[in-house]
Interface confidence: low
C-alpha cells in the first residue's frame, strides 16, 4: 500500500479500479456509485449490486463515489458580483463567474470577487482583462502606473517609486498625497 | 474564508475619543489597502478612510480628515482607526474594508461596531 493515505483511501486501493472495500467485510469489494448518484446501502456480497440513488434536487456528485450522502451545490455569492454560468445538476457543481468586462480577484482559493477591467484611462493596455487578471497598463508620459491606475506625475513625491519615471517632473512637485476623499 | 472583525466601538460624549481595530484573517493581510466605511442610522454607505498595503499612503473624507487616523500593524494583521473631537453626526456602524487597488470597490464582513457620539 502506498504510505500517508486516509483509512479510507487505504481501503480503497485493496480493490480494483471503479470498487470500494465493504466497510464490514474487507473481504468483498463493491462497484462505486455512479456520479450524480450516491451509496444508500452496501453490496450484499461479492458480484451483487450496490444500492445506488439519484441525489436530490439541491445536491450533486461529480464522480463515481461511495459517498452516503450528495454535495450540496454551490451558490454564487451576489455580493461578490458572482453570477451563475451554469446551474447546479445531479452530477455536476453550480458553476459561477463573473458578467462582461470583469475579472475574478481571488480572496482565497474558493472565494472570488468581481471587479471590472481597467479601461487604462491615461495609457494604454499593455496586456488585456482576462479571466482571473485585471488589464495590465502601460501608462502615457507624465503619468505613472500605481495599484494598476495611470496617475499623474504631479501627485508624485520624492520618497515614492514613481520618481525615475517622473523624473523631470518631480522638482516642481507639492506632497498633495495625504488629502485624497472619493 | 476572508474574515475581518470590528471592534472598539460604544457610547461617547461629543468631543471625546474612540480607537477601533480590525483583526483580519484569511487572506494576505500585507498584500492589500484596507480602509473604513459607515453607514449613519437610515443613511447609505459613506467612504472614510484608507491606507495604502504598506501604511506609505493615507487617504480621508473631508468629513474627518484632520481628527481621524487611519493605521495598520501588518505583524498582527491588524487595521485601527483612531477617532478624536468625535461629532453627533460621527455616530454610524463602522466597517473594516479590503480594497484592490485604491478606486475598486471595497467589501466587507462581519457585524461590524457602532459608534455613538451623543451627550
Known amino acids: 500500500l502506498v504510505p500517508h493515505l486516509g483509512d479510507r483511501e487505504k481501503r480503497d486501493s485493496v480493490c480494483p479500479q471503479g470498487k470500494y472495500i465493504h466497510p464490514q467485510n474487507n473481504s468483498i469489494c463493491c462497484t462505486k456509485c455512479h456520479k450524480g448518484t450516491y451509496l444508500y446501502n452496501d453490496c450484499p456480497g461479492p458480484g451483487q449490486d450496490t444500492d445506488c440513488r439519484e441525489c436530490e434536487s439541491g445536491s450533486f456528485t461529480a464522480s463515481e463515489n461511495h459517498l452516503r450522502h450528495c454535495l450540496s451545490c454551490s451558490k454564487c455569492r451576489k455580493e461578490m458580483g458572482q453570477v451563475e454560468i451554469s446551474s447546479c445538476t445531479v452530477d455536476r457543481d453550480t458553476v459561477c463567474g463573473c458578467r462582461k468586462n470583469q475579472y475574478r480577484h481571488y480572496w482565497s482559493e474558493n472565494l472570488f470577487q468581481c471587479f471590472n477591467c481597467s479601461l487604462c484611462l491615461n495609457g494604454t493596455v499593455h496586456l488585456s482583462c482576462q479571466e482571473k487578471q485585471n488589464t495590465v497598463c502601460t501608462c502615457h508620459a507624465g503619468f505613472f502606473l500605481r495599484e494598476n491606475e495611470c496617475v499623474s506625475c504631479s501627485n508624485c513625491k520624492k520618497s515614492l517609486e514613481c520618481t525615475k519615471l517622473c523624473l523631470p517632473q518631480i522638482e516642481n512637485v507639492k506632497g498633495t498625497e495625504d488629502s485624497g476623499t472619493t | 474564508e476572508v474574515q475581518l472583525l470590528e471592534s472598539g466601538g460604544g457610547l461617547v460624549q461629543p468631543g471625546g475619543s474612540l480607537r477601533l481595530s480590525c483583526a483580519a484573517s484569511?487572506?494576505?493581510?500585507?498584500?492589500?489597502?484596507m480602509g473604513w466605511v459607515r453607514q449613519a442610522p437610515g443613511k447609505g454607505l459613506e467612504w472614510v478612510s484608507q491606507?495604502?498595503?504598506?501604511?506609505?499612503?493615507?487617504y480621508y473624507a473631508h468629513s474627518v480628515k484632520g481628527r481621524f487616523t487611519i493605521s495598520r500593524d501588518n505583524s498582527k494583521n491588524t487595521l485601527y482607526l483612531q477617532m478624536n473631537s468625535l461629532r453627533a453626526e460621527d455616530t454610524a456602524v463602522y466597517y473594516c474594508?479590503?480594497?484592490?487597488?485604491?478606486?475598486?470597490?471595497?467589501?466587507?464582513w462581519g457585524q461590524g461596531t457602532l459608534v455613538t457620539v451623543s451627550s
Open positions: 474594508a479590503v480594497y484592490t487597488g485604491r478606486w475598486e470597490p471595497f467589501v466587507y
Open positions: 491606507i495604502s498595503n504598506t501604511a506609505d499612503r493615507t
Open positions: 484569511g487572506f494576505t493581510f500585507v498584500k492589500y489597502s
